[in-house]
Interface confidence: low
Amino acid sequence: GSQHIRAEKAMVDGSWLDLAKRSKLEAQPFAHLTINATDIPSGSHKVSLSSWYHDRGWAKISNMTFSNGKLIVNQDGFYYLYANICFRHHETSGDLATEYLQLMVYVTKTSIKIPSSHTLMKGGSTKYWSGNSEFHFYSINVGGFFKLRSGEEISIEVSNPSLLDPDQDATYFGAFKVRDID
Amino acid sequence: GSQHIRAEKAMVDGSWLDLAKRSKLEAQPFAHLTINATDIPSGSHKVSLSSWYHDRGWAKISNMTFSNGKLIVNQDGFYYLYANICFRHHETSGDLATEYLQLMVYVTKTSIKIPSSHTLMKGGSTKYWSGNSEFHFYSINVGGFFKLRSGEEISIEVSNPSLLDPDQDATYFGAFKVRDID
Amino acid sequence: GSQHIRAEKAMVDGSWLDLAKRSKLEAQPFAHLTINATDIPSGSHKVSLSSWYHDRGWAKISNMTFSNGKLIVNQDGFYYLYANICFRHHETSGDLATEYLQLMVYVTKTSIKIPSSHTLMKGGSTKYWSGNSEFHFYSINVGGFFKLRSGEEISIEVSNPSLLDPDQDATYFGAFKVRDID
């Protein structure tokens, strides 16, 4: 009897291990979204970027939702959020409207329940992109650890969107869940 | 009988907890590699950096391999990758070849099975390092969440390698596994 | 008897799942600390920033301690550390002491057992903030994966503290535990 119980326990514990591993490691939400260059707004004003890829190249998403330009949280938790934004200009694109630029990114959180938007992270630089150089480039990286609730939305705002680098390795943002909320 | 079974279950569950904790938390791959300043290439061209420390100071590696200048993935999974690259120049080092610099980093993934190299992340800035200032410094940080397969290799390319800051707190890259692949 | 044992096992395994989930996901240390603007040092020298929020807005802490301007590790482990530091200046604040600035951040680790301080990460840039522009801005982001022992302290040093951006989305640092030490 005792031997039978041990065997049964080993079998149950083994299947539990599989179940626990699967539920723990496969349900963990994440997203890595890359810029969709076919629909970058023009101008130098600050805009919300709504066109991102979620399913090609490096872009991917799991247990989160991408809709209307926003990354929607499906599962409460603490997440690490990050964004990498590259700006560039070449003289062949024509003269800049101004050589003094404010190149900025804002990672914002919007709550549907309480309709309000808050900036979680910002970064950037003022730049003097003089006509003495034919090519200019600048990248911003921000990252941080935030409590996110189901239904909250993450979006990206930038200044000077017409200067964005459209490569998937250049302009992207993402999130991955690290921890449950107590 | 019932009491004996409970005691045995507690004992098995306890050891299972230890086992599960160990297998989950100790086998998770990671690396933090710091620049090996004894072998930084000269020049201003774009090069792959092949000399990194993996076992001294802040540098460390576990369940990943460092070989031929590349960080090799041993375990399929989703990883957070990051790099911090610092450039600096002091007038005592002599004049720069050009005051207009493109200081860049590219984090690349190479697959041996399909011999091809792809840039996962890039960052940097064009800089005007004028002779009016005796010291110049600039740092780049990039990070992102990527699916990596066993055997794939991560490497770092930079422009102007001769300007790299050789400190372990300045120029480094790394990765840690966050999640299994479904 | 066998049916009773199975039922009992299911009950115990179920409670074990709850326990394991709680112990794993709720005890994981983290912190996200935002600048306390009421107490930013003046001047252009390099200083340790001691005033941070840990319990308002985006700021939060769990299973770590904030004391005397330092983030104290309570649990051995491998942690991902990050910092985002923003500097800004508007002409209405008066002229800068110098237009040539070194805007830097240093993330340091201090061990009480061996009273010594080491820089884990640094980043920044030399900047020429000319009087031709009324507003200047620059952000630094650094991040990396480090082994931290209970009792070790993380602190932030910056140059030109009087230029810090006091917003919670601008100037912050944090950590979260990723993995146990083998």
Epitope: A37, R88, E134, P166 | G43, H45, K46, Q102, S116 | -
Partner: antibody, heavy 115, light 108 residues
Framework: SVKESGGGLVTPGGTLTLTCTAS????????MSWVRQAPGKGLEWIGY?????SPYYANWAKGRFTISRTSTTVDLKMTSLTTEDTATYFC?????????????WGPGTLVTVSL | DMIQTPASVEVAVGGTVTINCQAS??????LAWYQQKPGQPPKLLIY???TLASGVPSRFKGSGSGTQFTFTISDVECTAAATYYC????????????FGGGTEVVVK
């Protein structure tokens, strides 16, 4: 402007190096591509090189073609040449580092592979 | 790789000609169009799928994104007689040829 040189007649199995030089801009600050065109045929991209290093090649060109650069030139070395490599070889400057648009082209240099 | 159609097209002066280019995978808007006349190197006309290069007349137009792209010449003049090529500018990894096969435009 850019200009290619080094073309001419070469026998099958031979090796030839073409050179691209520039005037009016610095080669060292620009990404450069090599493209070829067989007589009466279309354009065929060979490969490109970043400012200062790291060449990339079309799949078919890997192994036999090598792109390198000095501070003043961008070179294309071709080995084990066959009659199918007979073409006009163009050097072209990209619009910017990382942008694959070819903005300034040289007039080309003719390479003839024949016995 | 890039599939360009048609291989050849005739158009009358004042008419309109349309050339298509299909990518084997999505390339966003990373596409260029070039014009090449006999004995000359190619000339960049359009980049970013639809942006005219400096000095290029507005009668040349590019459109499309993803995998399907179109190049149109309206109000055709005799000087438009040339061969036109599309070129993907999305990736230089694992490429056989970045260029389409070309379209010869004959002006009657």
């Amino acid at each position: 402007s850019v200009k290619e040189s080094g073309g001419g007649l070469v026998t099958p199995g031979g090796t030839l190096t073409l050179t691209c030089t520039a005037s009016g801009f610095s080669l060292s600050n620009n990404a450069m591509s090599w493209v070829r065109q067989a007589p009466g045929k279309g354009l065929e991209w060979i490969g490109y090189i970043y400012p200062g290093g790291s060449p990339y090649y079309a799949n078919w060109a890997k192994g036999r073609f090598t792109i390198s650069r000095t501070s003043t030139t961008v070179d294309l070395k071709m080995t084990s040449l066959t009659t199918e490599d007979t073409a006009t070889y163009f050097c072209a400057r990209h619009v910017s580092d990382g942008g694959w648009y070819l903005y300034i082209w040289g007039p080309g240099t003719l390479v003839t592979v024949s016995l | 790789d890039m599939i360009q159609t048609p291989a050849s097209v005739e158009v009358a002066v004042g008419g309109t000609v349309t050339i298509n280019c299909q990518a084997s995978q999505s390339i966003g808007s990373n596409l260029a169009w070039y014009q090449q006349k006999p004995g000359q190197p190619p000339k960049l006309l359009i980049y970013g799928a639809s942006t005219l290069a400096s000095g290029v007349p507005s009668r040349f137009k590019g459109s499309g994104s993803g995998t399907q792209f179109t190049f149109t010449i309206s109000d055709v003049e005799c000087t438009a007689a040339a061969t036109y090529y599309c070129q993907q500018a999305y990736s230089i990894s694992n490429v056989d040829n970045a260029f389409g096969g070309g379209t010869e435009v004959v002006v009657k």
